[in-house]
Interface confidence: low
């Protein structure tokens, strides 16, 4: 005969654990039902009655099966430099990520706490490493034979055009100017752009039972603005 299914609340066998989506209530000393995501425990269980769950109120949520007496508050509204990539619902927190042209200078478990504008390399400097969702642009001086005449977070140093007859030699911030006869070869017919980082929703993972890889270690104090690196501009 199949074993009888116990209905909550029930006393667990010594040494055994409660089943999935149940928790052990020490006061009742019974296995009781957890509340589903989007709900919270309105009344805790007793020896004879199971947990009473209720829906989360507006602007609050529970993401996991739980027995919390109050739902968690959704995070504050996204700032002007952010995009809301996940709305606050009864089952999930709001997630804010950085808008295009910005990167996440201070991340949190999900989304971004502090966005900063991507560095722009000034003329004479090109992008050595493009910005990503979580890292700033790195600029480098244009090497001999290359130039950048833009203030940009995407343009790299481009080779000078090669002239039959040079009217004005190129430098780090200006292309060579040829005499009226056309150049023999152009190394760079147009500006070379690096792909702009696109802020996408960070992949959500369920919190593990040890979130200290999250809360206890992942929160950092926001740092003040750092001085612009050489070859960069705050524009």
């Amino acid at each position: 005969l199949p074993a009888q299914v116990a209905f909550t609340p029930y006393a667990p066998e010594p040494g055994s654990t409660c089943r999935l989506r149940e928790y052990y209530d020490q006061t009742a000393q019974m296995c009781c039902s957890k509340c589903s995501p989007g709900q919270h425990a309105k009344v805790f269980c007793t020896k004879t009655s199971d947990t009473v769950c209720d829906s989360c109120e507006d602007s609050t949520y529970t993401q996991l099966w739980n027995w919390v007496p109050e739902c968690l508050s959704c995070g504050s509204r996204c700032s002007s430099d952010q995009v809301e990539t996940q709305a606050c619902t009864r089952e999930q927190n709001r997630i804010c990520t950085c808008r295009p042209g910005w990167y996440c200078a201070l991340s949190k478990q999900e989304g971004c706490r502090l966005c900063a504008p991507l560095r722009k390399c000034r003329p004479g400097f090109g992008v050595a490493r493009p910005g990503t969702e979580t890292s700033d642009v790195v600029c480098k001086p244009c090497a001999p034979g290359t130039f950048s005449n833009t203030t940009s977070s995407t343009d790299i140093c481009r080779p000078h055009q090669i002239c039959n007859v040079v009217a004005i030699p190129g430098n780090a911030s200006m292309d060579a100017v040829c005499t009226s006869t056309s150049p023999t070869r152009s190394m760079a017919p147009g500006a070379v752009h690096l792909p702009q980082p696109v802020s996408t929703r960070s992949q959500h993972t369920q919190p593990t039972p040890e979130p200290s890889t999250a809360p206890s270690t992942s929160f950092l104090l926001p740092m003040g603005p750092s001085p612009p690196a050489e070859g960069s501009t705050g524009d």
Epitope: Q26, T27, L72, E210, P211
Partner: antibody, heavy 123, light 112 residues
Framework: EVQLVESGGGLVQPGGSLRLSCAAS?????????MCWVRQAPGKGLEWVGC?????????YYANWAKGRFTISRDNSKNTLYLQMNSLRAEDTAVYYC??????????????WGQGTLVTVSS | DIQMTQSPSSLSASVGDRVTITCQAS??????LSWYQQKPGKAPKRLIY???TLASGVPSRFSGSGSGTDFTLTISSLQPEDFATYYC??????????????FGGGTKVEIK
């Protein structure tokens, strides 16, 4: 840096009152964390005082010995936790620790402690 | 409130020894038990929660076991930095705080 800093400790006479503060920094002191006080008398073990749920108005839970004399409150706008202690006795002399506890079912129990503030009750 | 009884209250051991500390709850606390390490003048540090889950950054020589009322903390090979006082704590999270987060009396591990 993520930290809790207690203040307000000192010497107080028996029967007197004292309010301890705990300033939280480096993390969001909203209703995702619920905060507790633990004390430790000189040379003795740890003793749980009580906890407050994340919402400003409670609820609060206390050790039986603390009920009636000790009150825990919080000001989320100031990222600060308080412990109001009344009718103090010599046996309340201890280092008082502020402790952060995760409020949901993630197992993040008592994972962040302040450095403690010493309260001495003596005439 | 739940009472937590820890034993021994102190023990002497040498580096490399296997050390076992026990903790007994006055009623069943399922697996809602944490262990802490405290060094003189410092705040406690969490080692283990849910009776057997190692907290982040804690060396694997620490382990916990037990369920219900009887729990054990084991240090498989004692290191010089492990000489400290250890506390157990009944800690069932959300609704457990209706009846307390009692600590055990502590076990002081001293150099033999």
């Amino acid at each position: 840096e993520v930290q809790l800093v207690e203040s307000g400790g000192g010497l107080v006479q028996p029967g007197g009152s004292l309010r301890l503060s705990c300033a939280a920094s480096g993390f969001s002191f909203t209703n995702n964390y619920y905060m507790c006080w633990v004390r430790q008398a000189p040379g003795k073990g740890l003793e749980w005082v009580g906890c407050i749920y994340p919402s400003i108005v409670g609820p609060t839970y206390y050790a039986n010995w603390a009920k009636g004399r000790f009150t825990i409150s919080r000001d989320n706008s100031k990222n600060t936790l308080y412990l109001q202690m009344n009718s103090l006795r010599a046996e309340d002399t201890a280092v008082y620790y502020c402790v952060r506890d995760r409020y949901d079912d993630y197992g993040d129990y008592f994972n962040l402690w302040g450095q403690g503030t010493l309260v001495t009750v003596s005439s | 409130d739940i009472q937590m009884t820890q034993s021994p209250s102190s023990l002497s051991a040498s580096v490399g020894d296997r050390v076992t500390i026990t903790c007994q709850a006055s009623q069943s606390i399922y697996n809602y038990l944490s262990w802490y390490q405290q060094k003189p003048g410092k705040a406690p540090k969490r080692l283990i929660y849910y009776a057997s889950t190692l907290a982040s950054g804690v060396p694997s020589r620490f382990s916990g076991s037990g369920s219900g009322t009887d729990f054990t903390l084991t240090i498989s090979s004692l290191q010089p930095e492990d000489f400290a006082t250890y506390y157990c704590q009944s800690n069932s999270g959300v609704n457990g705080n209706r009846y307390g987060n009692a600590f055990g009396g502590g076990t002081k591990v001293e150099i033999k």
